[in-house]
Amino acid sequence: EVEKTACPSGKKAREIDESLIFYKKWELEACVDAALLATQMDRVNAIPFTYEQLDVLKHKLDELYPQGYPESVIQHLGYLFLKMSPEDIRKWNVTSLETLKALLEVNKGHEMSPQVATLIDRFVKGRGQLDKDTLDTLTAFYPGYLCSLSPEELSSVPPSSIWAVRPQDLDTCDPRQLDVLYPKARLAFQNMNGSEYFVKIQSFLGGAPTEDLKALSQQNVSMDLATFMKLRTDAVLPLTVAEVQKLLGPHVEGLKAEERHRPVRDWILRQRQDDLDTLGLGLQGGIPNGYLVLDLSMQEALS
């Protein structure tokens, strides 16, 4: 806490300007009116205040707005935002996307801090859902943002927002998240033609079921190995050798390099060796000729 002391004669601040950087902490506390500071917040960022001075300015705003800052002040916080705690931010009501952008800009280039996470949480909850503009903004600043959400939170993303998602935004998503996002993407892109559709849906395919992969195999999509390796193992296992060959097109040769890795390894174990041999890739580990394949999962279902 900064002690309350009278402002020395002639030092009362009439505006927020460069002269204040020479004020000691107690002088800032005594000589800067909190209401003046609130109305001229945009100037604070234009002045190279020190850490300690910024602490005093924050303290003055906290005293003026004990219930939380109004959006008119929040929008102009600039670098003072980095002084805020998650507890401070939970008191705010941020509704403007412009305010959100202004504060995210301050943290640009850094990892998502607890302050930013709290700010985004407050903003999204206030809006009720992750609309396209918000998602556009958040993924522009934090490409990994979508993948930081739980499947439950992702369920509030409307399919229309999926258009804002770029492939790199999904890099760190796990299968559970892609399971939620894939049906939304399928819905969002449903009116696109074959090749355009595949380009858009490709990065979401880690959530695709077997029947959708079978359908894609009929469309000459030439899926690359990197995408294939991200598919759900349980979705790949039922695919026949012919279907995988059609799905991958010229990329099928890449299976050899991946034969020890999932899902390729597990898929090979489910295929007849004769069928694998038709690929001419030297894939080994299939079911030997003459062996009977029992689908135990079907048997369990019947009993």
Partner: antibody, heavy 122, light 107 residues
Framework: QVQLVQSGAEVKKSGESLKISCKGS????????IAWVRQMPGKGLEWMGI????????IYSPYFQGQVTISADKSISTAYLQWSSLKASDTAMYYC???????????????WGQGTTVTVSS | DIRLTQSPSSLSASLGDRVTITCRAS??????LAWYQQKPGKAPRLLIY???TLESGVPSRFSGSGSGTDFTLTISSLQPEDFATYYC?????????FGGGTKLEIK
Amino acid sequence: QVQLVQSGAEVKKSGESLKISCKGSGYGFGAYWIAWVRQMPGKGLEWMGIIYPGDSRVIYSPYFQGQVTISADKSISTAYLQWSSLKASDTAMYYCARFGGPKFATNWFDIWGQGTTVTVSS
Amino acid sequence: DIRLTQSPSSLSASLGDRVTITCRASQAISSALAWYQQKPGKAPRLLIYDASTLESGVPSRFSGSGSGTDFTLTISSLQPEDFATYYCQQADSFPLTFGGGTKLEIK
């Protein structure tokens, strides 16, 4: 790459005027403060003042206020330090340095010019 | 103004030595302190800021510590290129001030 390039060495007589320059490149020159720092022969570093080229706001150290003028021309990414009447005691190495800028309360000098030697004879 | 006192003012050491330079502020400055290296005829170079954060590109043998009034710069194992003069600078309040420097020489 990010750099500050200063004008060459100057030899002057007492009472003459002088303007030395510092040209920035490789970054948004208008978005960072530029500082001037003096180093007298065999001595330490002294902060003289800073300028924000974006709008030419200047903050002088109380010890150099009225002794020098700091200015900038954002259009050519150049900051200046000038004297209207040099004294022998102005003999020193003068450095420009990038200061703070759009980072939070970063009041240190991360990029430096190579320095300009000013020699003033009486 | 905040005065910074560096000690020692000069220091002789050998290659591979561990060296510590101290900087004492005339009043508490939190962690608002930077360290610079200056070689003869060259401009200073930022090594450490915020008392302990290594500037990018600076070798990890350099480290900084301290807060309040007492700070240290440590070089864990001296290399030939480390012989120079080192300055501390406070960023807690204006006017910004530097320490008087510590000249590190080869023994």
